[in-house]
């Protein structure tokens, strides 16, 4: 999950190289899948260079790059947006929560870095992937529906993944075993545009079927870093057009953030989807 203010976002840190993700929609789910690593700090592999390069193991957070000061000490400085590549398509553009389109997340984080320490910078987040678009306000009635529809959708996405996963690269064996039980359950409500009453009834009746999908999606989103908390940026895939009622995502998770720390912990996430405290299990987040 991209950097977070309470964690590395607002303070200078030395951190692990961040695993990159791409927004991947499987069925209709922008699941995040690792595709590699990126470190714009000079990372050399030749041993003789390593010794001379103090930036080698000094990793900077998004929007910053490593440079040496006059004492040859590595320091993280804001990345120049001109060192970010031009977008090759609209799909690389991102929208911030102040409704500005950036050419890429690289441009966004470089800009956010220059605002570090300011109120504006603290409030600035990557909102969703793709150029900014009109998002209708989330009505109170829709907000009530959101967790029911999202929960049902998460279950259906996992079932779709299970059905498609011939080559074992979408789900692990352990995950497959869990989804197999859902897939083979004859009581399972098939995917479709169901009335809210039916979704609520199905959740009560088949409660156990929803526990794993809710945990699984948390794990899919918690990637930058994997720390058990979801930041505003990590929730960006849930604001994608393929998501049911995506215009309610931001408002919904604001209501979930019980301690108002701007991060969604697993217990807040699960609780928001109606999972009982006794059924919240970190080991289900794979």
């Amino acid at each position: 999950a991209p950097q977070q203010e309470a964690l590395p976002d607002e303070t200078e840190v030395v951190e692990e190289t961040v695993a990159e993700v791409t927004e991947v929609s499987v069925g209709a789910n922008p699941v995040q899948v690792e595709v590699g690593e990126f470190d714009d700090g000079a990372e050399e592999t030749e041993e003789e260079v390593v010794a001379e390069n103090p930036c080698q193991n000094h990793h900077c957070k998004h929007g910053k790059v490593c440079e040496l000061d006059e004492n040859n000490t590595p320091m993280c400085v804001c990345q120049d947006p001109t060192s970010c590549p031009a977008p090759i398509g609209e799909f690389e553009k991102v929208c911030s929560n102040d409704n500005k389109t950036f050419d890429s997340s690289c441009h966004f984080f470089a800009t956010k870095c220059t605002l570090e320490g300011t109120k504006k910078g603290h409030k600035l987040h990557l909102d969703y992937i793709g150029p900014c678009k009109y998002i209708p306000p989330c009505l109170d009635s829709e907000l009530t529906e959101f967790p029911l529809r999202m929960r049902d959708w998460l279950k259906n996405v996992l079932v779709t993944l299970y059905e498609r996963d011939e080559d074992n690269n979408l789900l692990t064996e352990k995950q497959k075993l869990r989804v197999k039980k859902i897939h083979e359950n004859e009581k399972r409500l098939e995917a479709g545009d169901h009335p809210v009453e039916l979704l609520a009834r199905d959740f009560e009746k088949n409660y156990n079927m929803y526990i794993f999908p809710v945990h699984w999606q948390f794990g899919q989103l918690d990637q930058h870093p994997i720390d058990g908390y979801l930041s505003h940026t990590e929730l960006a895939p849930l604001r994608a057009p393929l998501i049911p009622m995506e215009h309610c995502t931001t408002r919904f998770f604001e209501t979930c953030d019980l301690d108002n720390d701007k991060y969604i912990a697993l217990d807040e996430w699960a609780g928001c989807f109606g999972i009982k405290q006794k059924d919240i299990d970190k080991d289900l987040v794979i």
Epitope: G36, S83, P85, G89, F91, D167
Partner: antibody
Framework: QVQLQQSDAELVKPGASVKISCKVS????????IHWMKQRPEQGLEWIGY????????KYNEKFKGKATLTADKSSSTTYMQLNSLTSEDSAVYFC?????????????????WGTGTTVTVSS | DIQMTQSPASLSASVGETVTITCRAS??????LAWYQQKQGKSPQLLVY???TLADGVPSRFSGSGSGTQYSLKINSLQPEDFGSYYC?????????FGSGTKLEIK
């Protein structure tokens, strides 16, 4: 695993057109751009352009505008490249490749999987 | 458009030797560079991306380095399976141009 299977070799006459295909498997087709490259015997590789199957958007190398047309069929997870007004200069092996990319935290780009290649021979 | 100048065009080396192939970009490509290996009649295979990150399954004897406009691929202790052609490619902006290639042959 991820695979890009290309259509068989083509022998075509000068002035004609040819349509070659690249069928993907092992991942969700609409998630990645598919790029096409040209390689002439004993020569380097040239980037022709890409198609993004999710919305059908394309981008071409200026050099291949009017020569190549890229299309995608979501139902069969296949992208196509049509080459028209063929001359001997178009005789080459054509590759499709998947662009692996990261966009949430920074921009990452590289071709992680390549197609099997399709040989196009233009001869009368 | 950014042009990629690759050298040498060909190279003869023996098993166990170390070789270096270089690529120069006509403009700063900020590490958006990949290296590929291609065997005769086969598709290119990814070796390195982001100028220095080794792709999955690539032996550690391969390493990429460089920044700005100058990049290189080093192969330590050449193995028989390393012989073939090598290409660099930038991903800074479209068109994504390739270097002209380096043919690595057994001495």
């Amino acid at each position: 695993q991820v695979q890009l299977q290309q259509s068989d070799a083509e022998l075509v006459k000068p002035g004609a057109s040819v349509k070659i295909s690249c069928k993907v498997s092992g991942y969700t087709f609409t998630d990645h751009t598919i790029h096409w490259m040209k390689q002439r015997p004993e020569q380097g590789l040239e980037w022709i352009g890409y198609i993004y199957p999710r919305d059908g958007s394309t981008k071409y190398n200026e050099k291949f505008k009017g020569k190549a047309t890229l299309t995608a069929d979501k139902s069969s997870s296949t992208t196509y490249m049509q080459l028209n007004s063929l001359t001997s200069e178009d005789s080459a092996v054509y590759f499709c490749a998947r662009l692996a990319f990261g966009i949430i935290t920074t921009v990452v780009r590289y071709f992680d999987v390549w197609g099997t290649g399709t040989t196009v021979t233009v001869s009368s | 458009d950014i042009q990629m100048t690759q050298s040498p065009a060909s190279l003869s080396a023996s098993v166990g030797e170390t070789v270096t192939i270089t690529c120069r970009a006509s403009g700063n490509i900020h590490n958006y560079l990949a290296w590929y290996q291609q065997k005769q009649g086969k598709s290119p295979q990814l070796l390195v991306y982001n100028a220095k990150t080794l792709a999955d399954g690539v032996p550690s004897r391969f390493s990429g380095s460089g920044s700005g406009t100058q990049y290189s691929l080093k192969i330590n202790s050449l193995q028989p399976e390393d012989f073939g052609s090598y290409y660099c490619q930038h991903f800074w902006s479209t068109p994504f141009t390739f270097g002209s290639g380096t043919k690595l042959e057994i001495k």
